[in-house]
């Protein structure tokens, strides 16, 4: 996250953090039920371990935290990299988490943002994309939701309606590290960190989100039948 | 499989400009990002730069900064570096090179290295 | 910008022999770390990326390992074709840049 702030703990008990190797984190997730995240499709590796309930960017253990491995990771059918269509991913738990005020998941929103909704993204990404600076602790920021004109005439040719921008003005946006993880408007999850240019937070070149909305059907039965 | 195949080998005289190219047959640039790798003789590898085709952003070394260019035609797949004021000490082997760009514009943090190369294009530079 | 130092410059070894080389970077790169085997005249090749992972098709006896400044790169049991000049490479910011190289030479 470029030019956010520390979250306050406990505030956003629904972020996991993708982690390679003992503590390499690469992606954010979203807690969606006791036994589900969701991710970015890009997100997938062969072998991970999931995070949850933790503040610190530290490998450093705090008393809130869970510790998971995917046992199943099912990507959108329609997302094909290098594209960015369809850029969602579930992911199951090898067990549930135990409830508490560190871990908790967030309900998925099914009516689609509008424009000027402002929300909320959250990660452990870089907080500079030409230095690779990484945050001590889990980084928030307000953005708004942009209109889909606004959105494809920044990038042209490439948005479509699994997609939304959000952003603020120059200078804040989300960044590498932050993918597939939470843009929370009113409490409810709308979107996952997808892409954006690069370097991050330049003007007009908005961050760009999973629409949610567009998956609550797939989420479920997916879901359901796993 | 992708293969990238550069321009031939090239003499250019002190404070001309030179411009190699780098097609990828078999396949597209799409999803990777190009850099420019060159190495003198009997010396290492240096990085000069790269570029995004998919955006043409390019970012360089500040050693060349000033003197090169990187630029993409991704409707042709090919990748261009330009290197200009030679001199002497630019005699070398410029190699194209491609890497993912996983990681760059989708925002995940991971990094690939540099898995298929051009067969190297050598100049010479002599007065 | 992020300097690499490798060492040994070169190595004498015989097939068989187990061969290690190291790089340490001037700061941490995480895991943003990729190997190369360069022979006369030819292009490099890549066959680890992000430390220790292996690029497809590259055997088994290579292997890498490290994490933030200190990677080593190990050939379990040298074999004839492995007699190259072998580079690491930051990849965790720009610019990127190699090590100095290491020969690896027939004793």
């Known amino acids: 996250i470029v030019n956010g702030s520390d979250c306050q703990k406990d505030a956003q008990p629904w972020q996991g953090a993708l982690l390679l190797g003992p503590n390499k984190l690469y992606c954010g997730a979203v807690l969606i039920s006791p036994q589900w995240l969701l991710t970015a499709a890009h997100c997938r590796k062969p072998v991970f371990r999931i995070r949850l309930g933790h503040h610190s960017m530290s490998p450093v253990y705090e008393s809130g935290q869970q510790m998971f491995q995917g046992i199943k990771s099912i990507p959108h059918p329609g997302y094909s990299h290098p594209g960015h269509s369809n850029d969602l991913m579930l992911i199951k738990m090898n067990r549930k988490i135990r409830d508490s005020h560190s871990v908790k998941p967030v309900e998925i929103a099914c009516d689609c943002a509008t424009e000027g909704t402002r929300c909320m993204v959250s990660g452990w990404g870089t907080t500079s994309s030409s230095h690779n600076n990484f945050p001590k602790v889990l980084q928030c920021l307000n953005i708004t939701v942009l209109s889909e004109e606004r959105c494809k005439n920044s990038y042209p040719g490439q948005i479509d309606k699994t997609m939304f921008c959000a952003g603020d003005e120059e200078g804040r946006d989300s960044c590498q590290g932050d993918s597939g993880g939470p843009v929370v408007c009113n409490g409810k999850l709308q979107g996952l960190v997808s892409w954006g240019d690069f370097p991050c937070a330049q003007r007009n070149r908005p961050g760009v989100y999973t629409n949610l909305c567009e998956f609550v059907k797939w989420i479920k039965d997916t879901m359901n039948s796993n | 499989q992708v293969q990238l195949v550069q321009s031939g080998a090239e003499v250019k005289k002190p404070g001309s400009s030179v411009k190699v190219s780098c097609k990828a047959s078999g396949g597209t640039f799409s999803g990777y990002s190009i850099s420019w790798v060159r190495q003198a003789p009997g010396q290492g590898l240096e990085w000069m730069g790269l570029?995004?085709?998919?955006?043409?952003?390019?970012n360089y070394a500040q050693k060349f900064q000033g003197r090169v260019t990187i630029t993409a035609d991704e409707s042709t797949s090919t990748a261009y570096m330009e290197l200009s004021s030679l001199r002497s000490e630019d005699t070398a082997v410029y190699y194209c090179?491609?890497?993912?760009?996983?990681?760059?514009?989708?925002?995940?943090?991971?990094?690939?290295?540099?898995?298929?190369w051009g067969q190297g294009t050598t100049v010479t530079v002599s007065s | 910008d992020i300097q690499m130092t490798q060492s040994p410059s070169s190595v004498s070894a015989s097939v068989g022999d187990r061969v290690t080389i190291t790089c340490r970077a001037s700061q941490g790169i995480s895991s943003w770390l990729a190997w190369y085997q360069q022979k006369p005249g030819k292009a490099p090749k890549l066959l680890i990326y992000?430390?220790?992972s292996l690029q497809s098709g590259v055997p088994s006896r290579f292997s890498g390992s490290g994490s933030g400044t200190d990677f080593t790169l190990t050939i379990s049991s040298l074999q004839p074709e492995d007699f190259a000049t072998y580079y690491c490479?930051?990849?965790?910011?720009?610019?990127?840049?190699f090590g100095g190289g290491t020969k690896v030479e027939i004793k």
């Open positions: 992000a430390a220790s």
């Open positions: 490479q930051q990849v965790s910011s720009f610019p990127y840049t």
């Open positions: 570029i995004f085709p998919i955006s043409g952003t390019a």
């Open positions: 090179a491609r890497q993912s760009a996983s990681g760059y514009y989708d925002r995940s943090y991971y990094r690939y290295g540099m898995d298929v």
